[in-house]
């Protein structure tokens, strides 16, 4: 058993049929010595008396808010949560496996630049009685500070018969130099509590590996005389690290119709303009990637050909 | 300890091309190592990230773009003095700071070159003959060093009398390649910045 926060405790249980469970001793936070009784949740049934209560925690029915009273007055609470371990593996029932970039990916994180700011998100099908708490640091043995905000519900989607909820959190490394060469990864820890179930999820990464620039901005077309070719120009996204001559991007320019299976014109360039062949009912799209360290491409910025 | 904006004329900057070749060569070599040593811990997640130049050179700080010198987190207190001549410094206008930056890059390359050559000598003794360093990568390091053209004492190649542990050598190769790739990215950014200034 360990303390998650004040008056909230996590009991770690090996979860298998007829498991013996864990013996837990609760102590009432009071100077009083006698006349103390214990109840669980909203029940008025007295579970025991005395300053301490010893319980055998085996299942979710044994978890919950234990309260000690004296003469009708509440003295203190202890909330017990369960953390299940099945076949030596901690449960991951609360969050959905995003399977990208690999299996067992519950947290995904992205950074728009090298400023030390990043966003992580996760998915669940659970809609109520759900809380998240996020901590982060650079390195684990001698951790350096990363400050995370509160996790918020950022999107809701319908997937078949199920509703899927996306939560996200923004974090900022306390003293980040965009030009630094990272040698210690960022660690992100998410505590998830659903009713009386506790789970924790972690992710470890270098900012350089989660970079995904915003799409290029201000796409403009200039038709070339006596030709089917069009000059397309654009600018670096505002959120990208500066100076741009140091943090350079490379671009992919594509002309394609509505269907992905349609024919296309595609060219890669380090410049902020390119010449392509425009077709009726097609769109010109441009995306960006760090020129020197190949992490993710940005989403496409598009303009119609016509 | 930063790069001023008044740097050489773009046409006078021969190191950009060499630095691009360097990044390409080390990336290819790292990819080859990952594939060949698939049963060794050789991915970014599996290895310890070590920097053999730590406390010996200060490339990131010495080559910091002017725009980032206002960022206190970028200003490390490490001071290192370097020899200040070189053919990438294509004009007399070139500041002492830029010379410091380029000589720091030169020292990085020299250190990695020695490590890679020592390692290659060990790998050549491996009866499995599983992996060797790409001669192209070694040649590209050499070309960039020549383009930088700094006078500096030669670092003797480390020779070891004991029987090499090939497993450890291959893991060290992965660690070195990962670190060198990160440094090659920094070098490429620096050269691009200098070329554009």
């Amino acid at each position: 058993i360990w303390e998650l926060k004040k008056d909230v405790y996590v009991v770690e249980l090996d979860w298998y049929p007829d498991a013996p469970g864990e013996m837990v001793v609760l102590t009432c936070d009071t100077p009083e010595e006698d006349g103390i009784t214990w109840t669980l949740d909203q029940s008025s049934e007295v579970l025991g008396s005395g300053k301490t209560l010893t319980i055998q925690v085996k299942e979710f029915g044994d978890a919950g808010q234990y309260t000690c009273h004296k003469g009708g007055e509440v003295l203190s609470h202890s909330l017990l949560l369960l953390h299940k371990k099945e076949d030596g593996i901690w449960s991951t029932d609360i969050l959905k496996d995003q399977k990208e970039p690999k299996n067992k990916t519950f947290l995904r994180c992205e950074a728009k630049n090298y400023s030390g700011r990043f966003t992580c998100w996760w998915l669940t099908t659970i809609s109520t009685d759900l809380t998240f708490s996020v901590k982060s640091s650079r390195g684990s043995s001698d951790p350096q500070g990363v400050t995370c905000g509160a996790a918020t519900l950022s999107a809701e989607r319908v997937r078949g018969d199920n509703k899927e909820y996306e939560y996200s959190v923004e974090c900022q490394e306390d003293s980040a130099c965009p030009a630094a060469e990272e040698s210690l990864p960022i660690e992100v820890m998410v505590d998830a509590v659903h009713k009386l179930k506790y789970e924790n999820y972690t992710s470890s990464f270098f900012i350089r590996d989660i970079i995904k620039p915003d799409p290029p901005k201000n796409l403009q077309l200039k038709p070339l005389k006596n030709s089917r070719q069009v000059e397309v120009s654009w600018e670096y996204p505002d959120t990208w690290s500066t100076p741009h001559s140091y943090f350079s991007l490379t671009f992919c320019v594509q002309v394609q119709g509505k269907s992905k299976r349609e024919k296309k014109d595609r060219v890669f360039t380090d410049k902020t303009s390119a010449t392509v062949i425009c077709r009726k009912n097609a769109s010109i799209s441009v995306r960006a990637q760090d020129r020197y360290y190949s992490s993710s491409w940005s989403e496409w910025a598009s303009v119609p050909c016509s | 300890r930063n790069l001023p904006v008044a740097t050489p004329d773009p046409g006078m900057f021969p190191c950009l091309h060499h630095s691009q070749n360097l990044l390409r060569a080390v990336s290819n070599m790292l990819q080859k190592a990952r594939q060949t040593l698939e049963f060794y811990p050789c991915t970014s997640e599996e290895i310890d990230h070590e920097d053999i130049t730590k406390d010996k050179t200060s490339t990131v700080e010495a080559c910091l773009p002017l725009e980032l010198t206002k960022n206190e987190s970028c200003l490390n207190s490490r001071e290192t003095s370097f020899i200040t001549n070189g053919s990438c410094l294509a004009s007399r206008k070139t500041s002492f700071m830029m010379a410091l930056c380029l000589s720091s890059i030169y020292e990085d390359l020299k250190m990695y070159q020695v490590e890679f050559k020592t390692m290659n000598a060990k790998l050549l003794m491996d009866p499995k003959r599983q992996i060797f360093l790409d001669q192209n990568m070694l040649a590209v390091i050499d070309e960039l060093m020549q383009a930088l053209n700094f006078n500096s004492e030669t670092v003797p190649q480390k020779s070891s009398l004991e029987e090499p542990d090939f497993y450890k050598t291959k893991i060290k190769l992965c660690i070195l390649l990962h670190a060198f790739r990160i440094r090659a990215v920094t070098i490429d950014r620096v050269m691009s910045y200098l070329n554009a200034s």
Partner: antibody
């Protein structure tokens, strides 16, 4: 399986024209760009131009502009390349090639040898 | 027009050994570079697109690298069927242009 089958070898006199055909099978004809390139004996490849069979749009290499015409007949899934004012240096194997990507070629015809000789 | 220069023009290699072919562009072409294999009397066959992207059905011993002006096609271990002429082609701008070819011969 996508295939491009070209017409047979031709012998032409200087000053005349030649029209080489390229019949496509497998896949929808208008879903691909179709290009023509040529290779003179012992020489490298030379790109001549492309056509979008969907709308008849064409683009030619400046070297051949005014002398080459590329057309396409969607009903027969056939593309044609006509080269006029032939000279002896036009002696080459002419290839058609196609791709959904405009700028490179993933399927090629077998080639047609055009000999220009007096 | 962008001029593509291949080297060497002829490359003698022992079967089973690796081979590297170089292609240089007269100006920067990013990664807009494609590699083909051509055997005598046959049409070219696409091996690599955009400098390093493998093509389905092409053996994994063929790999490409490079960007800007310098590109390399590598065959990790030459098989008897790999002895042929290899061509590079730029797609950075029209007109599309090819290298003059590198003939890989049995040593």
């Amino acid at each position: 399986q996508v295939q491009l089958v070209q017409s047979g070898a031709e012998v032409k006199k200087p000053g005349s024209s030649v029209k080489v055909s390229c019949k496509a099978s497998g896949g929808t004809f208008s879903d691909y760009y179709l290009h023509w390139s040529r290779q003179a004996p012992g020489q490298g490849l030379e790109w001549m131009g492309w056509i979008d069979p969907e709308n008849g749009d064409t683009e030619y290499a400046p070297k051949f502009q005014g002398r080459v015409t590329i057309t396409a007949d969607e009903s027969t899934s056939t593309a044609y390349m006509e080269l006029s004012s032939l000279r002896s240096e036009d002696t080459a194997v002419y290839y058609c090639a196609r791709n959904k990507e405009l700028r490179y070629f993933d399927v090629w015809g077998q080639g047609t040898l055009v000999t220009v000789s007096s | 027009d962008i001029v593509m220069t291949q080297s060497p023009l002829s490359l003698p290699v022992t079967p089973g050994e690796p081979a590297s072919i170089s292609c240089r562009a007269s100006q920067s072409i990013s990664i807009n570079l494609h590699w083909y294999q051509q055997k005598p009397g046959q049409a070219p066959r696409l091996l690599i697109a955009f400098a390093s992207q493998s093509i389905s059905g092409v053996p994994s011993r063929f790999s490409g690298s490079g960007s800007g002006t310098d590109f390399t096609l590598t065959i990790s271990s030459l098989q008897p069927e790999d002895f042929a002429t290899y061509l590079c082609q730029q797609s950075n701008s029209f007109p599309l242009t090819f290298g003059q070819g590198t003939k890989v011969e049995i040593k």
